[in-house]
Every structure is written in structure tokens, then in C-alpha cells.
């Protein structure tokens, strides 16, 4: 029998550094977790112990946060070179930039292979990014090989911005080919790498014959064995085994997200390549896990440009940014509207005399609003100022919604007002009105909306029967804070831009900003 | 292999009914919007109605807003077509499709099944 | 409603030749455009989403371009498998729409 032992991230997005608890930015450095400096301690630590080792990434170490925007993915090819990563799938997320932004900043830089089988190149493109990714690398590992096959979300059109000249293809379909010529080399124990989530990762492990181990991400899925670690629900199982068409039986794994844990896998193979055994779970890069020196100081180095970024000024505001949980939470809040309305100037595009605009409207948790700003620091506002507001490196996305999933959307960010719960909604074209003297689910007795195919916007009621184009937080069109019905009834959703990259545009743009409370959001007399 | 196989298709009688149903696999069916389009013989192909993910949310065609009722069953992996007071202008081949993630145009396509509105 | 406008109606081209077929929305609809091939007798197949990406396993001869109202579809070399009749759809906005089509047959 053969023993190779897999580390594996996924979903990192751009957290070089340690992080609080819940990956934002770490305040406590005594409680923080994750980031490179700590991971390479680990897989040092595990290099050194084990004999046959890999060192696996399945996707999205792009975006996220100011060393994303800054370093646009050279930080990724860098400090996963420094790591000595010996392989990783592409990610959705890797598209972010265009194929420009994924080609010289990454797949020119890194010195280990990035894979995706399902990804073909077309046009002038294939020329150009021929040989810099690759459908699968055959690995030496020891005395073995080891072949791994990638893959990428069929939907990365949707969610990135891969362009024209790259195909998108069927994961199952693309991966079959690839593993049978691998087999045709020689290759016996084959590990499919991807990111397409944890149920196309079980559809793999079910359908692609000759795939031993599936390797995911994508879903951000938390799978262990035992008592948890930390705050992570596990979906199942680490490994989860899924018994494949031909009566084997696959482990799949994923390890959460933003390098909080490393996955660690057990593998053993008997001689044929056939899995024997499979035993692990995800290691909580806790502090008790003690920074890399070497890493940690590279990372300081890095991080001097991030600093000098991070304090320039984008504007000024001559008012206060109200975005305290007292506020944003409980009533409409300048900092909301703020927000809102730089969601709407992102999204402007008149192009059409009938329409000023294709879309007026905004809806965003209070919940999302972490901080407010002072104007008594000169009125400057800088990126780090934004970041305390906006932490979590969401997106503001474009859905449409029928009239009446607005209403219940509406209805729900009151349905236990008053407890300082984040669904309270903040909005922009919208003006509602709320009477709390209502039972729940039937509080909302007034809710207007701005025109769009109009040449002088104005509010008219909501009909429940149309379908309205509306900007939020991807956390919203997932159904993040109970908004449960805005996932289950959308009927189109587009990716949008970076939160923090919007508003601090618009800021740029507006060079001074005073945004007041000005009656979007109103209670009836009686109630409140 | 994505597939979409409909059923349910027939000859009624002008206002009679019929319901249309369309199994799918190969793919998360509780992931995607689903929807149905027609083409009437020798015409071009006609949006009729959409229905988001979860079922909560429909969207109609003004020709058959009131008399077609789209549903689904993710327990089953099947959409449905519930077509009342039929007239000969709804007589047409019903295709069943599957949208892209998010909405964005139909990728997939059942085979359609024939609807005759005749007395 | 969003008019979509096909033309022309219908083409005859030899084998290899270059074709172009174009659609016009009554209003922008950015790119959210989709072509669709339908042989008699049988259900459409998805050529191109987004106006211009081309869907899975079909071949690189087809290619979309355009954005807002002005849209084209193009096959570099007709083949004698490409006769068939073609439909331009936008979702940008419900209720989603079809253009005439156009049939493409060989000469």
C-alpha cells in the first residue's frame, strides 16, 4: 500500500493575512486565524513529518480584499510560489480582471501548474494562452505519480468576466477524455481539483470513471468529522464518500473558505491505485499555529504599498456617515444611502431615450453596514474608512424581481423590528412605509418605487405582478439574513463589482459628499 | 447528461384542458429557472412562461395570462404547463427549457410535445 | 414588449461561404442576447448566450458580436449540417422575445 497525504485550500479570496474569526480583517492578533504566514508553518510542519505530500488550491484565491485590488494576483502567484503549491484549479473569481488579469499576473508567474479541463481557449486567445494552463498534470510524487485533472465552473460567464474567446464546457463531459488518457499514460491514481461546488464535485465523484479523489470548492463547504473547531456548521462527513456508478467508493472533500482551515486528506492506494483508505479533517489554522517568520516578514514587506493605499484620500464628506448598528438597523441611515446610492451610479447605462435609467432601485441590509465615518477627521475619507464599512468583499449585484418578492422582502426586514437585527433594509428609489402596530408579514402600508422608463423619475406604487431590476448585495441574492424569498424567486441575477471598489468610486467621483435622511424610510404615526 | 423529456401533450377540445409535464435530469433542477416556449405550425417560437427556482415566483406570456398555470415539483424534478380554456391559437409544440444560472437565456431543451386544440 | 427583428427572412449561400444574419431590438438590452439553430422537426439548440459566448460543444465557426440593438450572427464556412433556421432572443427584460428567424438553406 501507498500512502500520499493532500493539503488542499479553496476559496481563500485574497487573505494573505491573518483574520478575525469570521475572516475579516484581524483586530486581535492573540485570536486570529489563517493567512499564508501560518499555512506554510503547517504544511512545513506536515512536509517534514510525512513523506508523500501535496499541496493543492481549488480556486478563487483572487478577490476579496485591498491586497486583491492593489496587486491584482501577482500577491497570489508570489506568495503560493513561496509556498511551494503544487497545483491549482482555476476559480471563477480568477476571471475577475478579464483573461488579461488572470494570464500575466498568474498563470505567467506561478511555478506550479494551474488546470482546467472544462475551459477551452478559442479565436486568437488559444495561441496566446496555449501551454499556461493546462485539462491535467501528471505529478511525481515519491516513487509514484499522481495525475491531477482540473476544473471551473460551467457558469463562470455569469458570475466573472472570462470573455468571449473562452468555452465553458460541461465539467463531467470535459473531465471524462482527460482521465482516460491519463489512464491510457499509465497513471493509476488520479485526483480531480476543481471548482464548481460541492454538488458537481459529488456528480464527479459519482460519473467520471477513473477518478479516485475529488478535490472542491466553490460552495465554501465545511465537511468534519467529530466535534467542530470553530463557528463552521459541517454539511457532512470529511471525507464525504460518494459510491460512484462503477461501485467504488470516492472521498470528496472541501475545506470552508479563506484560508481559516487547511484540508488535510489521508489517502491510501494498494498497488493498482485503488483507494483503500481515506481519513482526515480540515486543521484550524488557529494562533496555537505560530506565523512563519520568513513568510510573515515577506508579507509586512508587501504590505507597506497596501498602507500607502489604503490612507489616501477618495473624497471628502462635510456631514457624518451614520452607519452605527443603532441606526442602520433600526431606521434609514445616511450611510445607507450613501451606500445605495453609489449602487445605482454604478449601474448607469443610458443608452435608450425611453429610459433614464434600466434600473432605480436598491435594497441593502442594515446588517451589512459595520461602521460609520466621521467628518471631523478633516472630512477625509480613505479606503481603510471603507473597509470598516464594508469588510465582508461582497458584490452589489443586479437581480429582477417580481413586485411581490419585493413586498416580502420588504416585509421581513420588519418582522421582529426592534430587536437590532440586520435585515432591516436600507434602499435607494424606494420610498416605504412601515406600521409597526401591524402583526408581522403585514407591516408594509405604503411601498413606491422610481420610475425607469420615464424621462423625469418619479415614485408610482409597486404592482406585485411586475418584474423590477433591483441592486443588492450578493449576501441578499443568496439569501443571506432570512431573505430566503429573494433567492428562491428571482428570475435573473447578474454579478456585480466589488462593494467597497463601488463606493469608493463614487466618493472619487463626487469629490465631497453630504448625503442626508431624507424620508425613504418612514413609520406611520402611532407606531413608532 | 442534461436531459428534458416533456409528456402530457394531446388533442382537446377548444376550451377544454391539459396538463403538461417535463422531467429533467442530469443537472440541480432546484438551482435553475425553468420555462416553457411554443411554436405554432410553420411559425416562429413564442416565450409562454418562466418560473424561478424555488416555484415561489411566474412570470407569463399576456396571450395566456389567467388560463396557464406554470408550476414545479423539485421533490420530482418536474415542471409543469396546467393549461385551461384552450384555444385553437394555443395549438402548438410545447418545448420545456432550462435557463442558464441566474437567468441568462435558455441553454437546454426538451424535445416539445404537441398540443392540437380542435373540436 | 421588446421587439426583436430579424433579417433577412431567409438566405440561400453555397458551402463555404460567409453568412451573416443580423437582429435589431426595439431598445437597448446591453448584451443579454441569445441565438438559437432549429432543424425541422426538431427542438432549438443554444448557439450563443450573452451575445457573443459561444455555448458548450458548439463549433467555433459560429460567432455573435453586438450590444445594446444591433446584433449579428455569423458562420465563417456554411456547411451543409448548418441548414436550418435561426432565432435571436433577448433577456434582457420579461417578457423574453423571439426574432422572426431566418432559414438558411444551401444552395
Known amino acids: 500500500a501507498w500512502e500520499l497525504t493532500i493539503l488542499h485550500t479553496n476559496d481563500v479570496h485574497s487573505r494573505l493575512e491573518q483574520t478575525s474569526e469570521d475572516s475579516s480583517k484581524c483586530v486581535n492578533a492573540s485570536r486570529c486565524m489563517g493567512g499564508v504566514a501560518r499555512l506554510f508553518t503547517k504544511v512545513q510542519q506536515i512536509r517534514r513529518a510525512e513523506p508523500n505530500v501535496l499541496l493543492l488550491d481549488a480556486g478563487d484565491q483572487y478577490q476579496g480584499t485591498i491586497w486583491f485590488t492593489v496587486y491584482k494576483g501577482a500577491e497570489v502567484a508570489h506568495f503560493m510560489n513561496a509556498l511551494r503549491y503544487d497545483a491549482m484549479a482555476l476559480g471563477n473569481h480568477e476571471f475577475d480582471n478579464g483573461v488579461e488579469g488572470l494570464i500575466e499576473p498568474l498563470l505567467k508567474e506561478a511555478k506550479f501548474p494551474i488546470l482546467s479541463a472544462n475551459i477551452k481557449a478559442k479565436g486568437p486567445l488559444a495561441s496566446q494562452i496555449s501551454g499556461l494552463y493546462l485539462p491535467y498534470k501528471v505529478l511525481p510524487v515519491g516513487d509514484e505519480v499522481v495525475g491531477i485533472v482540473g476544473y471551473t465552473s460551467k457558469e463562470t460567464p455569469f458570475l466573472s468576466n472570462p470573455g468571449t474567446n473562452l468555452v465553458f464546457e460541461d465539467e463531467i463531459t470535459a473531465l471524462q477524455p482527460e482521465v482516460d488518457k491519463l489512464k491510457t499514460l499509465n497513471v493509476n491514481k488520479i485526483i480531480a481539483l476543481g471548482h464548481s461546488g460541492f454538488e458537481m464535485d459529488k456528480l464527479i465523484a459519482q460519473k467520471v470513471r477513473g477518478v479516485d479523489v475529488v478535490v472542491g470548492g466553490h460552495s465554501n463547504t465545511f465537511l468534519y468529522t467529530g466535534n467542530p473547531p470553530s463557528k463552521e456548521v459541517p454539511a457532512g462527513k470529511y471525507p464525504f464518500i460518494v459510491t460512484s456508478d462503477d461501485g467504488r467508493k470516492v472521498p470528496v472533500v472541501q475545506a470552508y473558505a479563506f484560508g481559516k482551515y487547511l484540508g488535510y486528506l489521508k489517502i491510501e492506494f494498494d498497488e493498482r491505485g485503488n483507494v483503500i483508505s481515506s481519513h482526515g479533517n480540515p486543521i484550524l489554522l488557529n494562533s496555537s499555529i505560530p506565523e512563519d517568520p520568513s513568510i510573515k516578514a515577506d508579507i509586512n514587506k508587501w504590505r507597506i504599498k497596501l498602507d500607502n493605499y489604503s490612507t489616501q484620500e477618495l473624497g471628502k464628506t462635510i456631514v457624518y456617515l451614520d452607519g452605527s448598528s443603532q441606526s442602520c438597523r433600526f431606521r434609514e441611515c445616511n450611510m445607507g444611502n450613501l451606500i445605495c446610492d453609489a449602487m445605482i451610479n454604478n449601474n448607469l447605462r443610458h443608452t435608450d431615450e425611453m429610459f433614464w435609467n434600466h434600473v432605480s432601485m436598491c435594497i441593502l441590509n442594515g446588517g451589512g453596514i459595520r461602521s460609520p465615518i466621521d467628518e471631523r477627521n478633516n472630512g477625509t475619507i480613505t479606503w481603510e474608512n471603507l473597509a470598516a464599512v464594508l469588510p465582508f468583499g461582497g458584490t452589489f449585484d443586479l437581480v429582477q424581481l417580481k413586485g411581490s418578492t419585493l413586498k416580502k422582502a420588504f416585509e421581513h426586514s420588519v418582522h421582529r423590528y426592534g430587536q437590532s437585527t440586520g435585515e432591516f433594509l436600507q434602499v435607494g428609489g424606494i420610498h416605504v412605509v412601515y406600521d409597526l402596530s401591524r402583526k408581522p408579514g403585514d407591516r408594509v402600508v405604503k411601498l413606491d418605487v422610481l420610475c425607469t422608463k420615464c424621462r423625469v423619475p418619479s415614485y408610482d406604487p409597486l404592482k406585485m405582478d411586475e418584474v423590477y431590476k433591483v441592486i443588492l448585495p450578493n449576501f441578499l441574492a443568496n439569501g443571506g439574513d432570512g431573505f430566503q424569498m429573494i433567492k428562491d424567486e428571482l428570475l435573473r441575477h447578474d454579478s456585480g463589482d466589488q462593494d467597497i471598489n463601488v463606493v469608493s468610486t463614487y466618493i472619487s467621483k463626487m469629490k465631497v459628499i453630504y448625503p442626508a435622511v431624507e424620508g425613504r424610510i418612514k413609520f406611520s404615526t402611532g407606531s413608532h | 447528461e442534461v436531459q428534458l423529456l416533456e409528456s402530457g401533450g394531446g388533442l382537446v377540445q377548444p376550451g377544454g384542458s391539459l396538463r403538461l409535464s417535463c422531467a429533467a435530469s442530469g443537472f440541480t433542477f432546484s438551482n435553475y429557472i425553468m420555462g416553457w416556449v411554443r411554436q405554432a405550425p410553420g411559425k416562429g417560437l413564442e416565450w409562454v412562461s418562466s418560473i424561478s427556482s424555488s416555484g415561489g415566483a411566474t412570470i407569463y406570456a399576456d396571450s395566456v395570462k389567467g388560463r396557464f398555470t406554470i408550476s414545479r415539483d423539485n421533490s420530482k424534478n418536474t415542471l409543469y404547463l396546467q393549461m385551461n380554456s384552450l384555444r385553437a391559437e394555443d395549438m402548438a409544440v410545447y418545448y420545456c427549457?432550462?435557463?442558464?444560472?441566474?437567468?441568462?437565456?435558455?441553454?437546454?431543451w426538451g424535445q416539445g410535445t404537441t398540443v392540437t386544440v380542435s373540436s | 414588449d421588446i421587439q426583436m427583428t430579424q433579417s433577412p427572412s431567409s438566405l440561400s449561400a453555397s458551402v463555404g461561404d460567409r453568412v451573416t444574419i443580423t437582429c435589431r431590438a426595439s431598445q437597448d438590452i446591453s448584451n443579454y442576447l441569445a441565438w438559437f439553430q432549429q432543424k425541422p422537426g426538431k427542438a432549438p439548440k443554444s448557439l450563443i448566450f450573452a451575445a457573443s459566448s459561444l455555448e458548450s460543444g458548439v463549433p467555433s465557426k459560429f460567432s455573435g458580436s453586438g450590444s445594446g440593438t444591433d446584433f449579428t450572427l455569423t458562420i465563417s464556412s456554411l456547411q451543409p449540417e448548418d441548414s436550418a433556421t435561426y432565432y435571436c432572443?433577448?433577456?434582457?427584460?420579461?417578457?423574453?422575445?423571439f426574432g422572426g428567424g431566418t432559414k438558411v438553406e444551401i444552395k
Open positions: 432572443q433577448q433577456y434582457n427584460s420579461y417578457p423574453l422575445t
Open positions: 427549457a432550462k435557463d442558464h444560472l441566474g437567468g441568462h437565456g435558455m441553454d437546454v
